[in-house]
């Protein structure tokens, strides 16, 4: 988590003076309450916008506005504190906003708003404004939250920030996965424009079952330029089981902007239409064993062979 | 492949304890919550809470707060979900799913019966 | 805590038929609603987040709409596979709660 460094964020508006300030999330009005509080915030929205920095990158960031309640409470308002909790990691990141003057009763009802908070793809955060300063310990509270869930680099808009492009984002391999006959599976997918070599991870699945009957790992060697852009093609060989016959094929990149933590894409393949009688797997079916220290998935030569090619 | 795999089906005497395990392939644990939920027979869902597989930070619903611990072990990618002084109407098919606030992966479901 | 209600409890439609199906948030949970399908002795699918954005692999058939406290999921030409129990469920705040689930049955 952090903030927007440029521009500068304002909470400035007609009829008020206030400054924005960083915030250790603990409001000295917790360590010292006051006998008079201001209500709770009305109207918490969180919304998805972007936002570009100085240097040109473009960020998700968190959107948050709300409104003041037309209570004479707002004779004791000083300021909100801002929070974001990032809800897996439990990070939290506050601002403050500290009224330089005190507010009065206007036509219009208040209305703040802040976009600096910059967040991450796929994570999940709960935000908070409170009004300041916080409540005496049995008094009622003077914050709002809300949950807010930021989209995954698949969703348009979030595909073009520079988070989701270091990741790969913006690489699509177009799999095509096709079973040739019943132990030989083609797999063909575009190369990206980098010189980053490429894992293709393969698991089997029976039918109707969610527990794999064979998985297999291939290492595709880093593209030349030329091949760049071009397709390319890969044959695995599928270990002859009954009933192994839908197959997910994920494709892992290794680009140098996200080295282990590219976005992965994947296909599957179904299995054929079942016979009216279908055999029955084997009790005896193979499952593999990892070797200590080895990784998710065994070598290529406990597995079968495999063989690609690029084409031009 | 995304998944969860839960524990097999327990049956349990009111007062007693149960543990059920949800083992997690297939992507970064850490990088996400697990959220437990329950379904009593032929009824609705009920959200139980989560724990962050990264932090261990949880959040319980209230009417199960003191009787649930929600745990996790990293190293195995497993999330554990125990839940104390057991009722009759604890009965329920007892679910993990992944992340905090939207479900986008389940497991299969354990079945707990609490029964004299 | 927000209440989630659900309706109809039950709904009987023919194969190929249009279905709407509706959940109301007893206060305003902006677009921070999911829906769930559920099948007799499996754990629920995903169909959509943030009101109205599929989850992956769900058929265009599914489509979410809505905001504040009013939502509908719309199945545009209902098929076999989509016999089964719908949930809505917000997740705008503590505690998150599920509506009671409508039934697809078959008339």
């Known amino acids: 988590l952090r903030l927007l460094d440029f521009p500068a964020p304002v909470c400035a508006q007609e009829g008020l003076s206030c400054r924005v300030k960083n915030s250790t999330c603990l409001d000295d009005s917790w360590i010292h309450p006051r006998n008079l509080t201001p209500s709770s915030p009305k109207d918490l929205q969180i919304q998805l916008h972007f936002a570009h920095t100085q240097q040109g990158d473009l960020f998700p960031v968190a959107h948050i506005e709300w409104t003041l309640q037309t209570d004479a409470s707002i004779l004791y308002l000083e300021g909100a504190e801002l929070s974001v909790l990032q809800l897996n990691t439990n990070e939290r990141l506050c601002v403050r906003f500290e009224f330089l003057s005190k507010l009065r009763h206007h036509h219009r009802r208040w209305r703040f708003t802040f976009s600096h908070f910059v967040v991450d793809p796929d994570q999940e955060y709960e935000v908070t404004v409170h009004h300041l300063p916080k409540p005496i310990p049995d008094g009622d509270p003077n914050h709002q939250s809300k949950n807010f869930l930021v989209p995954d680099c698949e969703h348009a808009r979030m595909k073009v920030t520079t988070p989701c492009m270091s990741s790969g984002s913006l690489w699509d391999p177009n799999i095509t996965v096709e079973t040739l006959d019943t132990q030989h599976l083609r797999v063909d997918f575009t190369l990206w424009n980098e010189s980053t070599h490429y894992q293709i991870l393969l698991t089997s699945f029976p039918h109707m079952e969610n527990h794999s009957c064979f998985e297999h790992m291939h290492h595709i060697p880093a593209p030349r330029p030329e091949e760049f852009h071009q397709r390319s093609n890969v044959t695995l060989t599928l270990r002859n089981l009954k009933g192994c016959c839908r197959h997910q094929v994920q494709i892992q990149p290794f680009f140098s902007s996200c080295l282990n933590d590219c976005l992965r894409h994947s296909a599957t393949v179904s299995c054929p239409e079942m016979p009216d009688t279908p055999e029955p797997i084997p009790d005896y079916m193979p499952l593999w064993e990892p070797r200590s220290g080895s990784s998710d998935y065994k070598d290529d030569d406990d597995k079968g062979s495999s063989h690609h090619h690029h084409h031009h | 492949q995304v998944q969860l795999v839960q524990s097999g089906a327990e049956v349990k005497k009111p007062g007693a304890s149960v543990k059920v395990s949800c083992k997690a392939s297939?992507?970064?644990?850490?990088?996400?919550?697990i959220s437990w939920v329950r379904q009593a027979p032929g009824q609705g869902l009920e959200w139980m809470g989560w724990?962050?597989?990264?932090?261990?930070?949880?959040n319980y619903a209230q009417k199960l707060q003191g009787r649930v611990t929600m745990t996790t072990d990293t190293s195995t990618s497993t999330a554990y979900m125990e839940l104390r002084s057991l009722r009759s109407d604890d009965t329920a098919v007892y679910y993990c799913?992944?992340?905090?606030?939207?479900?986008?992966?389940w497991g299969q479901g354990t079945l707990v019966t609490v029964s004299s | 805590e927000i209440v989630m209600t659900q309706s109809p409890a039950t709904l009987s439609v023919s194969p190929g038929e249009r279905v709407t199906l509706s959940c109301r948030a007893s206060?305003?949970?902006?677009?921070?609603l999911a829906w769930f399908q559920q099948k007799p002795g499996q754990a629920p699918r995903p169909l959509i987040y943030?009101?109205?954005t599929r989850a992956a692999g769900i058929p265009a058939r599914f489509s979410g709409s809505g905001s504040g406290t009013d939502f509908t999921l719309t199945i545009s030409s209902l098929q076999s596979e989509d016999f089964a129990v719908y949930y809505c469920?917000?997740?705008?705040?503590?505690?998150?709660?599920f509506g009671g689930g409508t039934k697809v049955e078959i008339k």
């Open positions: 297939g992507y970064t644990f850490t990088r996400y919550g």
């Open positions: 206060q305003s949970v902006s677009s921070n």
């Open positions: 469920q917000q997740y705008d705040n503590w505690p998150l709660t």
């Open positions: 724990i962050s597989a990264y932090s261990g930070n949880t």
């Open positions: 799913a992944r992340r905090q606030l939207y479900f986008d992966y």
């Open positions: 943030d009101a109205s």
